[in-house]
Interface confidence: medium
Amino acid sequence: AYLNASETTTLSPSGSAVISTTTIATTPSKPTCDEKYANITVDYLYNKETKLFTAKLNVNENVECGNNTCTNNEVHNLTECKNASVSISHNSCTAPDKTLILDVPPGVEKFQLHDCTQVEKADTTICLKWKNIETFTCDTQNITYRFQCGNMIFDNKEIKLENLEPEHEYKCDSEILYNNHKFTNASKIIKTDFGSPGEPQIIFCRSEAAHQGVITWNPPQRSFHNFTLCYIKETEKDCLNLDKNLIKYDLQNLKPYTKYVLSLHAYIIAKVQRNGSAAMCHFTTKSA
């Protein structure tokens, strides 16, 4: 209790002023529960077995709810997409109680974080999308999606990261909010696919006989599985698959006094086959 002193001045019958001081004990007025819990926040927790939500009231004290609907500041057994009304009171505040409308989100298992990356571009891009796989009655207007990948934040249902490094791991965290309340989240660590191998470096490429030629090279730096060597004479083209450990190949049974154009590229079989850039060279066979 605080002591509150108030002074009153009155005139006596003789006309002289009499000043009397009254000291009264007062209690500070309590706020209303409506005011006290005006900005109360709620977290929704989902039970996958019962397919029901629990709303956790973010308050510092153990509040009471009308009709005993809450225990330990939690409101249990809430059905998805149904509004529930909770009357919140506490001995630290007076009537009227705070009437809290719980806007229950859709069921968590109705959303799936899906990797939508196109295999052809999986070496340098990542696509992630929240997919809705079951029907619900919540208003989709109230659903928002958020992604955080490194220091990049996106407010979209679907994201595409481009110009990434091949064979690198990237982590994306995502959450879904219903009426600005987070109700589910997921993280994905995605490793980008093998990139296209680099270009082999041709060391020499020549013919020293009428029916033979030789090509030698250094392999590319990046990962690869095999080489493809193609040689073109006039309009004919022949291609060979060469083992990744080869650095030299002898061409036999060539046509005399003919120009051969050679192309050599490495490739890797990843999510798709990726071909590296081709190194080119040419020679002309000797006359017979």
Partner: antibody
Framework: QVQLVESGGGLVKPGGSLRLSCAAS????????MSWIRQAPGKGLEWVSY????????YYPDTVKGRFTISRDNAKNSLYLQMNSLRAEDTAVYYC????????????WGRGTLVTVSS | DVVMTQSPLSLPVTLGQPASISCRSS???????????LEWYQQRPGQSPRLLIY???NLFSGVPDRFSGSGSGTDFTLKISRVEAEDVGVYYC??????????FGQGTKLEIK
């Protein structure tokens, strides 16, 4: 209320181009995958293109692949269909429709816009 | 591509009588997640199509319960328990399981006898 309104249809010569638009209102457009579906006069429905909610993925049937391009502008709540190298068999009413996800259903359709390809 | 074949193509029905439309897919339309994305759409004369049934048997909101869907694998059926005058139009089945190759059936025209 939830609405889709197509525009941009009209008469075009074979080999010509046309761009259709679909204005969306009354819902969170950026959460929805969208499609264009057409109906030739007196014929059935034919799906012609799909775009995912963020515009990342696009799909087309072989009948229009390479000639039609679907795109969207989520900031403007708009869907587009660019049609090039038009043929007489592309004559149809073109509907835009929303699909909450790729595994969902077309729950809202526009009224359609008529495209006539004729010389 | 998945081909959806409807029968009959024309269906004359007496008011108050039941009607049934069949839809057959050229291959199974059960998705790898075990769900079947088979839908039915109604198109009344001069109107845009309207969703009736999704995922084989689920009635879309606002659709009268005289409509029902059934089937599995490759064979599906739309039934109307008692046909009313407002049911006149063309009915299309549609598969959304084999994405991205969406396909509609060729349509069944329901008319009053």
């Amino acid at each position: 209320q939830v609405q889709l309104v197509e525009s941009g249809g009209g008469l075009v010569k074979p080999g010509g181009s046309l761009r259709l638009s679909c204005a969306a209102s009354g819902f969170a457009f950026s959460n929805y995958d969208m499609s264009w579906i057409r109906q030739a006069p007196g014929k059935g429905l034919e799906w012609v293109s799909y775009i995912s909610s963020g515009g990342v993925s696009t799909y087309y049937p072989d009948t229009v692949k390479g000639r039609f391009t679907i795109s969207r502008d989520n900031a403007k709540n708009s869907l587009y269909l660019q049609m090039n190298s038009l043929r007489a068999e592309d004559t149809a009413v073109y509907y835009c429709a929303r699909r909450y996800d790729v595994w969902w259903y077309f729950d809202v359709w526009g009224r359609g816009t008529l495209v006539t390809v004729s010389s | 591509d998945v081909v959806m074949t409807q029968s009959p193509l024309s269906l004359p029905v007496t008011l108050g009588q039941p009607a049934s439309i069949s839809c057959r897919s050229s291959q199974s339309i059960v998705h790898s997640n075990a769900k079947t994305y088979l839908e039915w759409y109604q198109q009344r004369p001069g109107q845009s199509p309207r969703l009736l049934i999704y995922k084989v048997s689920n009635l879309f909101s606002g659709v009268p319960d005289r409509f029902s869907g059934s089937g599995s694998g490759t064979d599906f059926t739309l039934k109307i328990s008692r046909v009313e005058a407002e049911d006149v139009g063309v009915y299309y089945c549609f598969q959304g399981s084999h994405v991205p190759m969406y396909t509609f059936g060729q349509g069944t025209k329901l008319e009053i006898k």
